[in-house]
Interface confidence: low
Amino acid sequence: AGVFELQIHSFGPGPGPGAPRSPCSARGPCRLFFRVCLKPGLSEEAAESPCALGAALSARGPVYTEQPEAPAPDLPLPNGLLQVPFRDAWPGTFSLIIETWREELGDQIGGPAWSLLARVTRRRRLAAGGPWARDIQRAGAWELRFSYRARCELLAVGTACTRLCRPRSAPSRCGPGLRPCAPLEDECEAPPVCRAGCSLEHGFCEQPGECRCLEGWTGPLCTVPASTSSCLGLRGPSSATTGCLVPGPGPCDGNPCANGGSCSETPGSFECTCPRGFYGLRCEVSGVTCADGPCFNGGLCVGGADPDSAYICHCPPGFQGSNCEKRVDRCSLQPCRNGGLCLDLGHALRCRCRAGFAGPRCEHNLDDCAGRACANGGTCVEGGGAHRCSCALGFGGRDCRERADPCAARPCAHGGRCYAHFSGLVCACAPGYMGSRCEFPVHPDGVSALPAAPPGLRPGDPQRYL
């Protein structure tokens, strides 16, 4: 898991004669916004192919009005980063598409008009966790300067964000058996094994063999509720004597407010104060409407024409997410039967079947028993791509070729004596028991417990099991 971040530094007329003076048409003022699209791999892809790694839309920039006779400036840009979260591994090679859009604010019928001003495409190799990469690109008569990077989030590290690491509360040496996750010297791979019995819910450890308690819990294994804890209200580790610790991160740690929002703590939660143009619990929403084309991968946008109205993306088959930005993991439905391996090829699903199975979904069980004989009256049972023999009594082994002692498993209960017989076994029951395996006690009055003894059989008589 992680996030790709793009920072636009400047967008303006490129050098040389014939450069445009203004992005706005003659109809009046306009403002810019940007769309970023990420596609995996380095192949040349059609512009309309899905942004399979994700996409993001910036807020609108400040309104720009052309000043006659003034030198053509770099144009005013939207605030903040463009962020594209990715849930799986960072691919390392990708195509980056940055579109610059113009919103004209003149008196158009039907409200503002949008048009694509410039598009740049870069095919790049980039390791997650590295420094910002800077770039300058020309698109027609325009020049775009930007920086980008991919960084891991949550507990993921590594160039592909695939290794999980445990953040340490303070930079220090890792405990025995742990080594730092380069280049972050204050993180250690693999959580240590805590003291045996340490509460999973209320305890944790930073070194193997220890057990430290969260607020409200105490005791060597953090299983005792602390009615009056001396460290209540404190933030961070307390002394070892109190045996308690307020969970370190506060609600604003790591700043949950996106797009430059500022965070303030409220009881048990947080509140974001958002910059102009952003709102939502985490300032993650800009005033996006259907006119911005927020639905990716061919999604149909439904919503009001007025700029403040909400929108909904109706996604085509194979895509999901509020902006149809996520490809449906069709393999998660486990369509391949009988242990087949599922491969999502994009255009189709493919099942790679285990030996002994076939069909588009591995639904056909090949005849495992063809040409396989089970000896001594055994019957062949298909399953799992290999044949298995169900042997007649007195025989065992893979092909029922070995003689088996039916009494070896001591099948007669309650001290009954077992006799091997040509067609199976016979149990001679101890006094007080009956049944083919001596499993039923006999009541003292001579009436047996269920099931009743068959006619002609007295309790205690040997019974042959057929």
């Epitope: 709102y279 939502g280 109205s309 909400a310 929108y311 993306c313 997410g321 509020s322």
Partner: nanobody, 125 residues
């Protein structure tokens, strides 16, 4: 067509409790803001509580903090409003609203795309 259906309204004495439910049909709950609004006769519609379905983060109007609790069951496409310690001034028609994406700034009730028909709550003293 997306539909929101509220239920659970009724009449109750001051200090009593009610639990409102809102079921969304033909609508998936991912990345959605679900909110409860209320409107008393002759007054403006006001937002009471909101919840973001992805992470369960909530918001409450000052007038109901500590008394009302909003929750959701994504598997059932349902959002609830548990109302305790009801007061006569809580009397209103209560509406459920849905909006894809996160919750907008307070007061932006026009940004909710879908609305239920409402359920009446009457609190007598």
């Amino acid at each position: 067509e997306v539909q929101l259906a509220e239920s659970g309204g009724g009449s109750v004495q001051a200090g009593g409790s009610l639990r409102l439910s809102c079921v969304a049909s033909r609508y998936t709950f991912s990345s959605t803001c679900m909110a409860w609004f209320r409107q008393a006769p002759g007054k403006e519609r006001e937002e009471v509580a909101a919840i973001y379905t992805d992470d369960g983060s909530t918001w409450y109007a000052d007038s109901v903090k500590g008394r009302f609790t909003i929750s959701r069951d994504n598997a059932k496409n349902t959002v609830y409003l548990q109302m305790n310690s009801l007061k006569p001034e809580d009397t209103a028609m209560y509406y459920c609203a849905a909006r894809r994406w996160a919750c907008p700034r307070v007061g932006s009730w026009h940004e909710f795309a879908y609305w239920g028909q409402g359920t009446q709550v009457t609190v007598s003293s």
